[in-house]
């Protein structure tokens, strides 16, 4: 006789999924998707919602799978989830799946769109919030100013978007925004086209961030403080094709060393 | 309040197809395991099919073949394709979810199938 | 004919202890859990007890299970009038849902 009484039903929780080394990555890099039990299983599904096959299964006496996803296409991205089981349940009877794990396998992120909150004609002394704003959860955004080399202000969000406030006085001017993956191996995304803050009594208007002069294109992430930033060909993703708004290569941009968020 | 709500009973001739539908609400339909069990007039309960979260579906061997069962995890809804219908599988179907590590918590009211000419 | 036995009938006064059987054998009870079921008349079966001795929420400690070897129990004790009904074990094999072939209980 295996099998002793059993606790309720609650006591076989989800497990939980997660990737290495992000759940971003661009084409050709090795991911591993681990599935965590809260107790130790017999057997681990990994699945995508909507198809009838799992795609893989890990037979391991332990609390942890491991599913190795070998140079990633961006066919591989998707949502995935994952299961467990003992062989004493049911046949067919699985825990509930995992939340579900987004993969995305991509050279570069959708663009942003940047906006100015409440709008981009400032009143004296006014404040205003630039709100640039992509598709994903947990990314960095980086703001830039024209005819500023180095990024305006980094942000960090759980959101998938970021607000960058600026102090009335110093707010008309040129912007423009994009974001990227909080740590290596980076994605970028697309700059966004660019906004134009004026004082009450002049016209803003949006142009494409390639025609407007004077603009530095991004440079790298920043890294954590007190790490060296990446060097250019660490984060750049393969096929990335950022438009500079300076007449220079993109080979000739200086890595930014991590910014202490200086505001403006 | 979790609910369970069979549909697509009635009277049909021998060897005609019927197909059965169970709504549930109250619950994330797509995380859990359902199966349909049926009972024949004054008999006991007969399991007949499970659908998993993912993987085959899986068939007591007295219906392999003659019934299909499916679901729709948008419309959270469990479904039975019976064909070549006899006179024995005159029944009350029951739709079910299954709980760890196996049993049935939760099942619907069922839904009367009558195969006779 | 059910691969888990029961006896058919089962009957009791009211307050008395009443117990159920179900034989199977080491492929699902002896190897697997066990649950019971109440299907009063008219009505879909209940849910009374899961994993072989374990009550769901709203169901009274008059209900008991046990499980030995290749055989299950269900133990009804201050037997009520409206626990007339039929009584339906259920356990499982490697690829297979079972039930027993159901208990009516009498309450004389």
């Known amino acids: 006789d295996i099998t002793p009484s059993v606790p309720p039903a609650s006591y076989h929780p989800k497990p939980w999924l997660g990737a290495q080394p992000a759940t971003v990555v661009t084409p050709g890099v090795n991911v591993t998707l681990r599935c965590r039990a809260p107790q130790p299983a017999w057997r681990f599904g990994l699945f995508k919602p909507g198809e009838i096959a799992p795609l893989l299964f890990r037979d391991v006496s332990s609390e942890l799978a491991e599913f190795f996803l070998e140079e990633v296409t961006p066919a591989q991205g998707g949502i995935y989830r994952c299961c467990y089981r003992r062989p004493d349940w049911g046949p067919g009877v699985w825990s509930q799946p995992s939340d579900v794990l987004e993969l995305l396998v991509t050279e570069e992120l959708p663009r942003p769109s940047l906006v100015a909150l409440p709008g981009p004609v400032v009143g004296p002394g006014a404040n205003v919030s630039l709100r640039c704003a992509g598709r994903l959860r947990n990314m960095s955004f980086v703001l830039y100013r024209e005819g500023v080399a180095a990024p305006l202000q980094y942000r960090h969000s759980a959101q998938p978007w970021a607000d960058f406030t600026l102090l009335g006085a110093r707010a008309p001017g040129t912007y423009s925004c994009y974001y990227h993956t909080p740590s290596a191996p980076y994605v970028l995304s697309q700059r966004s086209e660019v906004l134009v803050i004026s004082w009450e009594g002049e016209g803003p208007e949006a142009r494409p961030a390639s025609s407007a002069p004077g603009m530095q294109a991004p440079g790298p992430p920043p890294s954590d403080p007190g790490a060296q930033a990446p060097s250019l060909s660490s984060f750049r993703p393969r096929g990335l094709v950022l438009q500079p708004l300076l007449p220079q290569t993109q080979d000739s941009w200086d890595p930014a060393p991590p910014p202490s968020d200086p505001g403006v | 309040e979790v609910q369970l709500l069979e549909s697509g009973g009635g009277l049909v001739q021998p060897g005609g197809s019927l197909r059965l539908s169970c709504a549930a609400s109250g619950f994330t339909f797509s995380d859990y395991y359902w199966t349909w069990v049926r009972q024949a007039p004054g008999k006991g309960l007969e399991w007949v099919s499970g659908s998993p979260v993912f993987g085959a579906a899986n068939y007591a061997q007295n219906f392999q073949g003659r019934f299909t069962i499916s679901r729709d995890n948008s419309k959270n809804t469990l479904y039975l394709q019976m064909n070549s219908l006899r006179a024995e599988d005159t029944a009350v179907y029951y739709c079910?979810?299954?709980?760890?590590?196996?049993?049935?918590?939760?099942w619907g009211q069922g839904t009367l199938v009558t195969v006779s000419s | 004919q059910s691969v888990l036995t029961q006896p058919p009938s089962a009957s009791g006064t009211p307050g008395q202890r009443v117990t159920i059987s179900c034989s199977g054998s080491?492929?699902?009870?002896?190897?697997?859990?066990v649950s019971w079921y109440q299907q009063l008349p008219g009505t879909a079966p209940k849910l009374l007890i899961y994993g072989n001795s374990n009550r769901p929420s709203g169901v009274p400690n008059r209900f008991s299970g046990s499980k030995s070897g290749t055989s299950a129990s269900l133990a009804i004790s201050g037997l009520r009038s409206e626990d007339e009904a039929d009584y339906y074990c259920?356990?499982?094999?490697?690829?297979?849902?079972?039930f027993g072939g159901g208990t009516k209980l009498t309450v004389l």
């Open positions: 079910a979810k299954a709980g760890i590590p196996g049993h049935f918590d939760i």
């Open positions: 259920q356990s499982y094999d490697s690829s297979s849902w079972l």
């Open positions: 080491s492929s699902n009870i002896g190897n697997n859990y």
